[in-house]
Interface confidence: low
Amino acid sequence: SAPGEDEECGRVRDFVAKLANNTHQHVFDDLRGSVSLSWVGDSTGVILVLTTFHVPLVIMTFGQSKLYRSEDYGKNFKDITDLINNTFIRTEFGMAIGPENSGKVVLTAEVSGGSRGGRIFRSSDFAKNFVQTDLPFHPLTQMMYSPQNSDYLLALSTENGLWVSKNFGGKWEEIHKAVCLAKWGSDNTIFFTTYANGSCKADLGALELWRTSDLGKSFKTIGVKIYSFGLGGRFLFASVMADKDTTRRIHVSTDQGDTWSMAQLPSVGQEQFYSILAANDDMVFMHVDEPGDTGFGTIFTSDDRGIVYSKSLDRHLYTTTGGETDFTNVTSLRGVYITSVLSEDNSIQTMITFDQGGRWTHLRKPENSECDATAKNKNECSLHIHASYSISQKLNVPMAPLSEPNAVGIVIAHGSVGDAISVMVPDVYISDDGGYSWTKMLEGPHYYTILDSGGIIVAIEHSSRPINVIKFSTDEGQCWQTYTFTRDPIYFTGLASEPGARSMNISIWGFTESFLTSQWVSYTIDFKDILERNCEEKDYTIWLAHSTDPEDYEDGCILGYKEQFLRLRKSSVCQNGRDYVVTKQPSICLCSLEDFLCDFGYYRPENDSKCVEQPELKGHDLEFCLYGREEHLTTNGYRKIPGDKCQGGVNPVREVKDLKKKCTSNFLSPEKQNSKSN
């Protein structure tokens, strides 16, 4: 039988009446154009909604926008457009919401052509009040908050000036001209690239990378011949043009650009690209594009310095620079990532790693599913997940995979079951163990979201027809109830719930439509009365993550330790609550070969835990450049996975010797770097 329709499914008692009492409709009193929604702060209940319209096929001449505010998680909204003097807000800049619970909001206004500069509206009290500020420049980008101090803002101007404010946008100062890209680093540091000759585009590959640690009082040039740069975890990366040709290489710094090392990654040509797929304080996943317009590349994983890389996955699907990749960090279980590979026959297959890129495998076939037409063997196939690439290809996939750190083990995604991703209409699958096993959760494409740290999953069918029904599950997607939230169906445009999945409120957004008038409408449903009581100790059960063989003493060991979690029983219908904290108990494991990645010059053949020498490097000395000195690597092929906590057990030899020889990439060596003050 279909999921949720067998006899085992107990119905939630009296849920229709409970939900009806907690369903709040709000009709927005304006024509429907586009809508953007932002949460202001965490657990504040404050939502800002900006509607803008400039509508063809409807008699409208001017763009107009309205601003609405809710302070009860979307149950009621107040039109606060007058607080921004009924100004047209530029949607391409969105609403710049301050970090953490600063309560800061910046809106960028549309101004008439001849004006000296742009205009912003600033709030520092969760959008209760706004101050209008005229800018001495026209912004090119959204205002960017310093992660450390929400009073510090930076923006680029349309004339490529870098502007900084130290008092939350009240006063602005241009600290540098000819700037292409600027980013906040840690400790209120700003990194930016500058051009010397024509423009950012013309100077690509000849840019300079600068740093200021005092908001523009003094500067240090930390790199030249720069193509681009990026920050990930504690690493600063720059792609740098080679001296002799048009190739470029990645250089990495862990000290804010004072010293650099060349990353042991292949160089790339003009048409290729590098991309940081994921980064934390331990390591980096780096994609290196293949030569030619192949649509794929190779994933490499770094050591703890970001310098030495191991090949992690071949033929990784990544279409073009800034294009589509399915690479997904499964945030509900440590070490798990999902992505797609392009096989030799040009079909796309999903791969998963449970050990941070050490080994990749196909996803296990869901037990309640049949292999589709793509499968050569009808009994042997796997689950393939639809993500960004499928969405970009306009397949019937309304949402990317979903996981939440506080909904341990839960992953929800659209997929198909076969030898490769299918273009047929997908179904929705769920894993409750971080991707090891999967079950078909819903037939056909749906929008979905997680509430109350996994205590409730909500879904809405993806349809071109108007809808009025929402589905919900209190047992991690095994059984589903349906609730009709309105008599008059609406054209559905999106589900909105507070980021972090701790809320019990869901907002359903859509519009009612006639040819000349179209109105936004939202329905906010509070599930608090469905989960009537707070969860108690008896509602939780002990779960060992990454468990594949309970008989094995090392069962559950991933990255050198295992973790036991307290997880809500599927049968318990209770509230985890907003203050729910994931309870976990780690324990250290003995080291095995699984705790080591293949070292520079080595790779792991498929389905083998041993690392073997790369044929092209056999018999060569393994030397690489570190902080401008040549290093010699003595290794039997293994290095500890960054972040791996194992102790004892297997201990492969690894030694790095300073060859006392100078080596330079074409990058500025530290002693040549210059500083200047304003």
């Epitope: 154009g33 063809p56 096929l57 071109s464 054209y491 439509e513």
Partner: antibody, heavy 124, light 106 residues
Framework: QVQLVQSGAEVKKPGSSVKVSCKAS????????ISWVRQAPGQGLEWMGG????????QYAQKFQGRVTITADESTSTAYMELSSLRSEDTAVYYC?????????????????WGQGTTVTVSS | DIQMTQSPSTLSASVGDRVTITCRAS??????LAWYQQKPGKAPKLLIY???SLESGVPSRFSGSGSGTEFTLTISSLQPDDFATYYC????????FGGGTKVEIK
């Protein structure tokens, strides 16, 4: 691939009406706007009106207001344009065209798919 | 209704020429403008939407620019297949077309 197939040529007497059909295949009919555009011999293009089949409400160019009726039947994925009180200057090729549109808000893509055209001749 | 004025109405050019057609709106239409190509006896074909976005499958020698009231369609290097009539069309209210520009062989 979306296709729009129109009904055949018509010869009409002045004062009568003509109803031209436009059948869509290979895509979601309801989420697009359908526009009707005509072209008199040797003349340029003239927009008559449009409809969003999923919503049923039509909009007409001022010039044709009261004389043209645009409807849609979702079940057959067909749009219709009926022009009444025909006169000789209504002799033209009548096209239906798909107007791209994003669910959730309008996003103008232009008329990206056209029917083959229906010749309507008004003559006594 | 917004009026769209296209110029020139006829344009003689040779293969390889750079061709520019202008379209002026009677009031600002932001970027809600499309360009079409039509050959005798055929339905129009969409080339450019939203003033400057190239429709998929259209050769890159076609480009559009402008916003507000002034718009241009440029063919960077005229090909034999490009001799046709070109129309602009606005969609900032009721839809209206320009009068057309016939590009003929010099």
């Amino acid at each position: 691939q979306v296709q729009l197939v129109q009904s055949g040529a018509e010869v009409k007497k002045p004062g009568s009406s003509v109803k031209v059909s436009c059948k869509a295949s290979g895509g979601t009919f309801s989420s697009y706007a359908i526009s009707w555009v005509r072209q008199a011999p040797g003349q340029g293009l003239e927009w008559m009106g449009g409809i969003i089949p999923g919503f049923g409400t039509a909009q007409y160019a001022q010039k044709f207001q009261g004389r043209v009726t645009i409807t849609a039947d979702e079940s057959t994925s067909t749009a219709y344009m009926e022009l009444s009180s025909l006169r000789s200057e209504d002799t033209a090729v009548y096209y239906c065209a798909r107007q791209g549109r994003k669910t959730g808000y309008y996003y103008y893509y232009g008329m990206d798919v056209w029917g083959q055209g229906t010749t309507v001749t008004v003559s006594s | 209704d917004i009026q769209m004025t296209q110029s020139p109405s006829t344009l003689s050019a040779s293969v390889g020429d750079r061709v520019t057609i202008t379209c002026r709106a009677s009031q600002s239409i932001s970027s809600w403008l499309a360009w079409y190509q039509q050959k005798p006896g055929k339905a129009p074909k969409l080339l450019i939407y939203k003033a400057s976005s190239l429709e998929s499958g259209v050769p890159s020698r076609f480009s559009g620019s402008g916003s507000g009231t002034e718009f241009t369609l440029t063919i960077s290097s005229l090909q034999p297949d490009d001799f046709a009539t070109y129309y602009c069309q606005q969609a900032d209210g009721h839809i209206t077309f320009g009068g057309g520009t016939k590009v003929e062989i010099k």
